[in-house]
């Protein structure tokens, strides 16, 4: 898909900036602007990504216990929290025609959940109550996505500060389930 990933303490997803989706065609001028197809930019280019970590989508791994009322999972589950900036503040030379980079403001990309995975967990309850099985939905990967009005607000937790914040609140595309099951899925204990 044109996404490189490499591991540090967290996984950093660095988008191939040339592959950012363009705004809808009706928002574009009809001019062809891909300099890469027309001989490209002179060698010195200010938009090369010098510090790639400044604009990256990080997958931070968090371990937590799933709870449902007084019950708690026997083992902790590991899931991802999406964090980081998606830019582009500097564009790679081969991305020139892909966006209206000369504009002072442009498409806003956010580091948000891309894929989810289901995991079955066993909940242990106090007082000799029988263990319960619960299926929880966990973030499996993150991706830089352009904001649209259809994005669920829980995906778009404000990244006004650089600190990674665990995502709380309703997950996107929820299936019908009991309130208790929702609680089990969403109660964070980082």
């Amino acid at each position: 898909q044109g996404w490189q990933a490499f591991k540090n303490d967290a996984t950093e997803i660095i988008p191939e900036l040339g592959e950012y989706p363009e705004p809808p065609p009706e928002l574009e001028n009809n001019k062809t602007m891909n300099r890469a197809e027309n001989g490209g930019r002179p060698p010195h280019h200010p938009f090369e990504t010098k510090d790639v970590s400044e604009y990256s989508c990080r997958e931070l791994h968090f371990t937590r216990y799933v709870t449902d009322g007084p019950c708690r999972s026997a083992k902790p589950v590991t899931e991802l929290v999406c964090s980081g900036q998606c830019g582009p503040a500097r564009l790679l030379p081969n991305a020139i025609g892909r966006g209206k980079w000369w504009r002072p403001s442009g498409p806003d990309f956010r580091c948000i959940p891309d894929r989810y995975r289901a995991q079955r967990v066993q909940l242990l309850c106090p007082g000799g109550e029988a263990p319960r099985a619960r299926k929880v939905r966990l973030v499996a990967s993150c991706k830089c996505k352009r904001l649209t009005r259809f994005h669920n607000q829980s995906e778009l937790k404000d990244f006004g500060t650089e600190a990674a914040r665990p995502q709380k609140g309703r997950k996107p595309r929820p299936r019908a389930r009991s309130a208790k099951a929702n609680q089990a899925e969403l109660e964070n204990a980082y």
Epitope: G99, W101, W102, P107
Partner: antibody, heavy 119, light 111 residues
Framework: EVQLVESGGGLVQPGRSLRLSCAAS????????LHWVRQAPGKGLEWVSG????????DYADSVKGRFTISRDNAKNSLYLQMNSLRVEDTALYYC????????????WGQGTTVTVSS | QSVLTQPPSASGTPGQRVTISCSGS????????VNWYQQLPGTAPKLLIY???QRPSGVPDRFSGSKSGTSASLAISGLQSEDEADYYC????????????FGGGTKLTVL
């Protein structure tokens, strides 16, 4: 030192033309996208036009489209704004501004040149 | 009438935290990055925040930006007398042919 210096402002009658210039120094000129932003007396900022490194990369505000033309001469480190069919509402302080970071705001500004359109 | 809506004025005392809001729509703030500018009396504007929450070098970390949905805000903590200025939000607007739009500006007074 990064510097943008505007010139060409003055008093002009409605319907007439004026050409503003912006001379750049202290940085690699063609690394920058350049823009004109104006500010009417006592009012807020209004973006007028912007240009990338060539003529295919140009945007205009609807209020000036068809009347104003932005251009640049990289050999002369200069930005221009040709203003035709001037209106009273075009009266403002015109700033030249630039950005060398895609979608990164206007991080270099000149001090402005005043255009007064009056009969 | 500006496309982006800001309160005309705001005030605070030295040391206080002040927040300036900027409201837009999905064609501007909702889908594009937000910038903030500071204009001290009698001077040209200065870039304060780009890409919603990034500070250019030289801008104190007392200034911070954030964005949620179709609104953005600029927070100034530890207010100082030299922060008295006009503050403008701006974003690209995708409607019609598209243009860079500014808020009407907020005059910040340090009491």
């Amino acid at each position: 030192e990064v510097q943008l210096v505007e010139s060409g402002g003055g008093l002009v009658q409605p319907g007439r033309s004026l050409r503003l210039s912006c001379a750049a120094s202290g940085f690699t000129f063609d690394d920058y996208a350049l823009h004109w932003v104006r500010q009417a007396p006592g009012k807020g900022l209004e973006w007028v036009s912007g240009i990338g490194w060539d003529e295919d990369m140009i945007d205009y505000a609807d209020s000036v489209k068809g009347r104003f033309t932005i251009s640049r001469d990289n050999a002369k480190n200069s930005l221009y704004l040709q203003m035709n069919s001037l209106r009273v509402e075009d009266t403002a302080l015109y700033y030249c501004a630039g950005n060398n970071r895609g979608y990164g705001g206007l991080d270099v500004w000149g001090q402005g040149t005043t255009v007064t359109v009056s009969s | 009438q500006s496309v982006l809506t800001q309160p005309p004025s705001a005030s605070g005392t030295p040391g206080q935290r002040v927040t300036i809001s900027c409201s837009g729509s999905w064609s501007n703030i909702g889908s594009n990055t937000v910038n903030w500018y500071q204009q001290l009396p009698g001077t040209a504007p200065k870039l304060l925040i780009y890409n919603n929450n990034q500070r250019p070098s030289g801008v104190p970390d007392r200034f911070s930006g954030s964005k949620s949905g179709t609104s953005a805000s600029l927070a100034i903590s530890g207010l100082q007398s030299e922060d008295e200025a006009d503050y403008y939000c701006a974003a690209w607007d995708d409607s019609l042919s598209g243009e860079y739009v500014f808020g009407g500006g907020t005059k910040l007074t340090v009491l």
